[in-house]
Interface confidence: low
Amino acid sequence: IWELKKDVYVVELDWYPDAPGEMVVLTCDTPEEDGITWTLDQSSEVLGSGKTLTIQVKEFGDAGQYTCHKGGEVLSHSLLLLHKKEDGIWSTDILKDQKEPKNKTFLRCEAKNYSGRFTCWWLTTISTDLTFSVKSSRGSSDPQGVTCGAATLSAERVRGDNKEYEYSVECQEDSACPAAEESLPIEVMVDAVHKLKYENYTSSFFIRDIIKPDPPKNLQLKPLKNSRQVEVSWEYPDTWSTPHSYFSLTFCVQVQGKSKREKKDRVFTDKTSATVICRKNASISVRAQDRYYSSSWSEWASVPCS
Amino acid sequence: RNLPVATPDPGMFPCLHHSQNLLRAVSNMLQKARQTLEFYPCTSEEIDHEDITKDKTSTVEACLPLELTKNESCLNSRETSFITNGSCLASRKTSFMMALCLSSIYEDLKMYQVEFKTMNAKLLMDPKRQIFLDQNMLAVIDELMQALNFNSETVPQKSSLEEPDFYKTKIKLCILLHAFRIRAVTIDRVMSYLNAS
């Protein structure tokens, strides 16, 4: 048993048929010694008397809010949550496996630049009685500070018969140098509580590996005289790290016909312009990637050819 | 990603081309190591991230773009320990900080060169003959060092009579390649920045 926060405790249970469970001793937070009684949740049934209460926690029925009283007055509460371990593996019932980039990916994180700011998100099909708490640090044995905001519901979508809820959180490394070479990964820890079930999820990454620039901005076409060619130009996204001569991007320019089956023409360039042939009803798209460290490409910025 | 390789103009900052080749070579070598040593911990998640140049050079600090010198987090350990004259910059542009920066890069390359050569000597003794260092990568390190043209005493290659632990050496190779790739990225950024300025 361990304390998650004030008056909230997590009981770790091996979860199998006829498991013996865990013996837990609760102590009433009061100077009083006599006339103390204990109840569970909203029940008025007295479970025991005295300053301490010993219980055998085996299942969710044994979890909940234990309250000690004296003469009708509440003295203190202890909320017991369960953390299930089945076949040596902690349960992951609350969040959905996003399966990207690999199986058992429950948290996904991205950064738009090297400033030390990043966003993590996760998915669940649970809509109520759900709380999340996020902590983060740089390194684990001698952690350096990362400040995370509150997790918020950022999107809802329907998948078949199910509704899926996306939660996200923004974090900022307290003292980040964009040019630094990371040797310790960022650790993100999410505590998830659904009713009386506790689970924790972790992700470990280097900012350099989760970089995904915003799409190039101000994408413009300039037709070239007496030619089917056009000059495409764009700019670095505002959110990208500066100076751009140090944090350079490389770009992919794509000409795509209306039909997805049509052949795509692609050009790679380090410049912020390119000359391409503009076909009728086609569109021109440009995306960006760190020039020197191949993390994710940005989403496409697009303009129609016409 | 296969991008066409641009040939630098004769007037272009001469080290930029070499640093681009360096990053390409170390990335290829790392990819080869990951594939060849698939049963070893060789991915970024599995290895311990070590920097053999730690406390020896200060490349990130010495080569910090001017725009980032206002960022206090970047100035924790700004050192000024390298005063030399490199040939990568036209002399009129060579400032104290630039010389310091290029000298630090040179020292990095020298340290990695020694480590890689020592490691290759061990790998050549492996009866499994599983992996060797790409000679192109070693050559590219050499070329960039020559382009930087700093006078420095040569460090003798570490020789050892003991039977090497080939497992350890291969894990160490992965660690070294990951670290060197990160440093090569920094070097490329620096050269690009100096070229633009």
Epitope: - | E50, I52, K158, S160, P164, K168, I171
Partner: antibody, heavy 119, light 107 residues
Framework: EVTLRESGPALVKPTQTLTLTCTFS??????????VSWIRQPPGKALEWLAH???????YYNPSLKSRLTISKDTSKNQVVLTMTNMDPVDTATYYC???????????WGQGTTVTVSS | DIVMTQSPDSLAVSLGERATINCKAS??????VAWYQQKPGQPPKLLIY???NRYTGVPDRFSGSGYGTDFTLTISSLQAEDVAVYYC?????????FGGGTKVEIK
């Protein structure tokens, strides 16, 4: 939870062969880069590495004792066996088996077994 | 064989004070050095690997540094439970070798 336990005779006579067994749990020698080492420590003295066996049966020995040592493993039983021939009173020591993992250091140790060589 | 020479042989430090143990390798061992703590009647415990990486669960008052031939283990603020013998070990090359040990006591 990783545990290692050494077993073998507490007393052996000079010139006899010592056989020590390390029984471990919580990890497998089927996993790459896992290995088990034997280390000894004479009373009041420093540690001395004896031998190591890797997951794929590659073996390393301390050259000063190589001719007397044999290390082997039984992966299915989670056991590693060390034999040391021609025992001498100077071989009196606590013998430890240890796991050497990815970190390339002895991260888990058995409690050790004390072996006395005396006639 | 690579010889690991530890100094001093023993060290008496007041509680809360800094304790520093040195280890010198007879040839370069890169950063392939581990540090162990051994209390009487117990097996050694891993503290530091790859010269400067604290092992899981090791208090942050323990730190390691060094590269090549010279290595240091520092206990920034000695606690009563730190009384033990400390060993350095190289696994750069076979045979893996240990230092002679440094006994740390309270002054």
């Amino acid at each position: 939870e990783v545990t290692l336990r050494e077993s073998g005779p507490a007393l052996v006579k000079p010139t006899q062969t010592l056989t020590l067994t390390c029984t471990f749990s919580g990890f497998s020698l089927r996993k790459s880069v896992m290995g088990v080492s034997w280390i000894r420590q004479p009373p009041g003295k420093a540690l001395e590495w004896l031998a190591h066996i890797y997951w794929d049966d590659d073996k390393y020995y301390n050259p000063s004792l190589k001719s007397r040592l044999t290390i082997s493993k039984d992966t299915s039983k989670n056991q590693v066996v060390l034999t040391m021939t021609n025992m001498d009173p100077v071989d009196t020591a606590t013998y430890y088996c240890t796991r050497r993992g990815i970190r390339s250091a002895m991260d888990y140790w058995g409690q050790g077994t004390t072996v006395t060589v005396s006639s | 064989d690579i010889v690991m020479t530890q100094s001093p042989d023993s060290l008496a430090v007041s509680l809360g004070e800094r304790a520093t143990i040195n280890c010198k390798a007879s040839q370069s061992v890169s950063n392939d050095v581990a540090w162990y703590q051994q209390k009487p009647g117990q097996p050694p415990k891993l503290l530091i690997y790859y010269a400067s990486n604290r092992y899981t669960g090791v208090p942050d008052r323990f730190s390691g540094s060094g590269y090549g031939t010279d290595f240091t283990l520092t206990i920034s603020s000695l606690q009563a439970e730190d009384v033990a013998v400390y060993y350095c070990q190289q696994d750069y090359n076979s045979p893996w070798t240990f230092g002679g040990g440094t006994k740390v006591e309270i002054k």
